[in-house]
């Protein structure tokens, strides 16, 4: 674990990164089951 | 604690160099590690920064022109092809902490570029 | 990346006056400043992070107030080694504004 100023928000952002990534995913997965099913 | 630059010396324009950035008594795997130069009688110029896992970002004005890249006790800033603005003492740093209220430096180390 | 302005460049001032240096960001950096102090020959030290919050071991002297694109750092009771230059530094999504230092104000303190 770190406590540097620097390395705090990088850990934030990075981890907003991920999460976005994930919903991104998702978010596709489902797009392209619908266009699938259609 | 300690933080100390290494690698400076005269080298003619063109010719590749390393510095190297040695720590010891804390890790670099939980702290971001910055590189800072100062041209003889100048202010103070930020290169770049290495975080905890690896990954780097650069001024603008140094993108191409420097790498940073770390094992686990030695950080590095390789100057590509050296000009003689890029005389200067060359700076590493341990970023500042929130609870332990400081950051760490060392001395520096000068590169001269002359032909 | 963002720019960061710093003034004047140079100040005198009397042992016991009280000096004001003044850093201004090209955009808002909220409160993701440092101040440092230099003297010939060594390393930066830092006094003060998050705009204001005094590093371990650095004088109550010493005061850094500001946000957004306004800082300053106010240096009160002045002493003969508080004689340095001084350099503020941004350090606010670093990976995408970078961290460039102020121009430096070198402090003559008379």
């Known amino acids: 674990h770190s406590d540097g100023i620097f390395t705090d928000s990088y850990s934030r952002y990075r981890k907003q990164m991920a999460v976005k990534k994930y919903l991104a995913a998702v978010l596709g997965k489902r797009y392209k089951q619908r266009v699938k099913n259609k | 604690q300690s933080v100390e630059e290494s690698g400076g010396r005269l080298v003619t324009p063109g010719t590749p160099l390393t510095l190297t950035c040695t720590v010891s008594g804390f890790s670099l795997s939980s702290y971001a590690m910055i590189w800072v130069r100062q041209a003889p009688g100048k202010g103070l110029e930020w290169i770049g920064i290495?975080?905890?896992?690896?990954d780097t970002y650069y001024a603008s004005w140094a993108k191409g022109r420097f790498t940073i890249s770390k094992t686990s006790t030695t950080v590095y800033l390789k100057i590509a092809s050296p000009t003689t603005e890029d005389t200067a003492t060359y700076f590493c740093?341990?970023?500042?902490?929130?609870?332990?209220?400081?950051?760490?430096w060392g001395q520096g180390t000068l590169v001269t570029v002359s032909s | 990346d963002v720019v960061m302005t710093q003034t004047p460049a140079s100040v005198s001032e009397p042992v016991g006056g009280t000096v004001t240096i003044k850093c201004q960001a090209s955009e808002n950096i909220y409160n993701s400043l440092l101040w440092y102090q230099q003297k010939p020959g060594q390393p930066p030290k830092l006094l003060i992070y998050r705009a204001s919050t005094l590093a371990s071991g650095v004088s109550s002297r010493f005061k850094g107030s500001g946000s957004g694109t306004e800082f300053t750092l106010t240096i009160s009771d002045l002493e003969c080694a508080d004689a340095a230059t001084y350099y503020c530094?941004?350090?606010?999504?670093?990976?995408?504004?970078?961290?460039?230092f102020g121009g430096g104000t070198e402090v003559v303190v008379k």
């Open positions: 290495i975080y905890d896992n690896g």
């Open positions: 740093a341990r970023e500042p902490g929130s609870t332990t209220q400081n950051d760490l």
């Open positions: 530094q941004n350090y606010y999504n670093i990976w995408t504004n970078g961290a460039a």
